[in-house]
């Protein structure tokens, strides 16, 4: 997978008036990395590993960049003409990637009230607008403003692309991201399925990087894909990932089944626990925690694009 840096900024307006402040998160390699603390008006690392990336350096540069980006986005929202009464949001997601072959990609996406209306490839400067008439109107609005704004010239987009990549390279240079491996905790549970059957679920949690093999084996041989159910590999909010795999087996045949896990060159096998069948949920309920986002987002059900 490529290394990536993703900026996620949101600004709000109420009855056509742009609210002060902004929400910002930065993800490094898909993990929550920085968050803008609106009380302290500073960029804050998300967890110990994020702190380790910069070591003893300060987060002043990140604070300055996020503050500048937030200000730009508030100005952009102010120029969106069709703001009706009530609450509205403008979200900007900017991503840059460095691939294994050292090639790079950069893009920028704008969402209004959770709906994508404008994307730009920051390398080719090519804009893309969804088909809907609302998106077309919004996109024209924003593009006109960006053209008017002397800062938003070709040079500006090249700079955005270059800055993002420069920051990503700076973070990778610390080596923390590259050499970081956290082995998974693996846990096998069983639950009642139907008459004579049980569902066995194998969960792997708190692992990094995200690449993992998790599969059920019968007599040491992997079960076919169609007899297993997999969960997505999802961030767990601690800079690590979680996933699960489940299958249905005949009661009494538990001894034949093991969960096989392979991660970062290490592997393990985990038997089905014997004994009383526990009535457990066989699938995780995945809650997306948004790391202290403003309550107004929850209250107004504004979509947050991950």
């Amino acid at each position: 997978e490529p290394h990536s840096l993703r900026y996620n900024l949101t600004v709000l307006s109420w009855d056509g008036s742009v609210q002060s402040g902004f929400l910002a998160e930065v993800h490094l390699d898909g993990q929550p990395f920085l968050r803008y603390d609106r009380q302290k008006c500073r960029a804050k690392p998300q967890g110990q590993w994020a702190e380790d990336v910069l070591g003893n350096k300060t987060w002043d540069r990140e604070t300055r960049d996020l503050t500048g980006n937030g200000k730009d986005l508030r100005m952009t929202l102010a120029h969106i003409k069709d703001q009706k009464e009530g609450l509205h949001s403008l979200q900007e997601i900017r991503v840059c990637e460095i691939h294994e072959d050292n090639s790079t990609r950069s893009s920028q996406h704008f969402y209004y009230d959770g709906e994508l209306f404008l994307s730009q490839n920051l390398e080719t400067e090519e804009w893309t607008v969804p088909q809907s008439s609302r998106a077309q109107t919004l996109a024209m609005n924003v593009r006109n403003f960006l053209k008017e704004d002397a800062m938003k010239t070709k040079t500006h987009y090249h700079a955005m692309h270059a800055d993002c990549l420069q920051e990503l390279r700076r973070y990778l240079e610390s080596g923390v991201v590259l050499r970081r491996t956290v082995p998974p905790m693996v846990n096998v549970t069983r639950s009642e399925a139907s008459e004579g059957n049980i569902t066995v679920t194998c969960r792997a949690s708190s692992f990094y990087p995200r690449n993992i093999i998790l599969t059920w084996r019968q007599d040491g041989v992997s079960l076919s894909h169609d007899t297993q159910q997999w969960g997505d590999v999802l961030p767990d909010g601690n800079g690590t990932y979680q996933t699960w795999v489940a299958t249905r087996i005949c009661r009494g045949e538990e001894q034949r089944f093991t969960c096989y896990m392979e991660h970062s060159g290490n592997h393990s096998t985990h038997p089905v626990p014997s004994g009383k069948v526990l009535v457990l949920q066989s699938h995780w309920q995945h809650h997306h925690h948004h790391h202290g986002l403003n309550d107004i987002f929850e209250a107004q059900k504004i979509e947050w694009h991950e």
Epitope: Q218, D219, G220, V221, S222, H267, T269
Partner: antibody
Framework: QVQLQQSGPELVKPGASVKVSCKAS????????IYWVKQSHGKSLEWIGY????????VYNQKFKGKATLTVDKSSSTAYMHLNSLTSEDSAVYYC???????????WGQGTLVTVSA | DIQMTQTTSSLSASLGDRVTITCSAG??????LNWYQQKPDGTVKLLIF???SLQSGVPSRFSGSGSGADYSLTISNLEPEDIATYYC?????????FGAGTKLELK
């Protein structure tokens, strides 16, 4: 490539015990089960049991419970089958086998002849 | 235990022949069936797994088919190195069980 090298032939007395070894090479030993199979002279194959080298977990054919004990030594990538209270019925060629994770008994050892005779 | 029956204990064929070896299980085994070849020197090799999947490195003249309780192994064009004993094996239920074997000889 995957290889399973078994110990040499054994001539043992009735009532005694024997330990057959199976040294694995060419793959990560703890990744895949080791299976044991018996073939009496001129007869078919019988599955004895298997062991998971990662955690030592075993599953036996009921018929061989109490007769065979499966163990592993991870440090030398070697699996062992201990046969006790031997009788002439236990005279046979014993095979170890492993898997590639997709099919049973994918790779086989060359077999170990155990002869029980007074 | 699931009984695996190979009705033909020995079979004579000529080089180039198409040979079919059959195997039936005491009950349905959901295609959980493998085929093995044992050479006269005792060497054992997996040929087919899960009824019809050809093991890597096995010549394509070998094929497997079947469902329910009845299965077969076919050698489309018999070669000298195919002279061996062939065993079917089920892994639907424990204990894992093998057929009695079919010894293939040259006419």
């Amino acid at each position: 490539q995957v290889q399973l090298q078994q110990s040499g032939p054994e001539l043992v007395k009735p009532g005694a015990s024997v330990k057959v070894s199976c040294k694995a090479s060419g793959y990560a030993f703890t990744k895949y089960n080791i299976y044991w199979v018996k073939q009496s002279h001129g007869k078919s194959l019988e599955w004895i049991g298997y062991i998971d080298p990662y955690n030592g977990g075993t599953v036996y054919n009921q018929k061989f419970k109490g007769k065979a004990t499966l163990t592993v030594d991870k440090s030398s990538s070697t699996a062992y089958m201990h046969l006790n209270s031997l009788t002439s019925e236990d005279s046979a060629v014993y095979y170890c086998a492993t898997t590639d994770g997709y099919s049973l008994f994918t790779y086989w050892g060359q077999g170990t002849l155990v002869t029980v005779s007074a | 235990d699931i009984q695996m029956t190979q009705t033909t204990s020995s079979l004579s064929a000529s080089l180039g022949d198409r040979v079919t070896i059959t195997c039936s299980a005491g009950q349905g085994i959901n295609n959980y069936l493998n085929w093995y070849q044992q050479k006269p020197d005792g060497t054992v090799k997996l040929l087919i797994f899960y009824t019809s999947s050809l093991q890597s490195g096995v010549p394509s003249r070998f094929s497997g088919s079947g469902s329910g309780a009845d299965y077969s192994l076919t050698i489309s064009n018999l070669e000298p190195e195919d002279i061996a004993t062939y065993y079917c094996q089920q892994y639907s239920k424990l204990p894992l069980t093998f057929g009695a074997g079919t010894k293939l000889e040259l006419k």
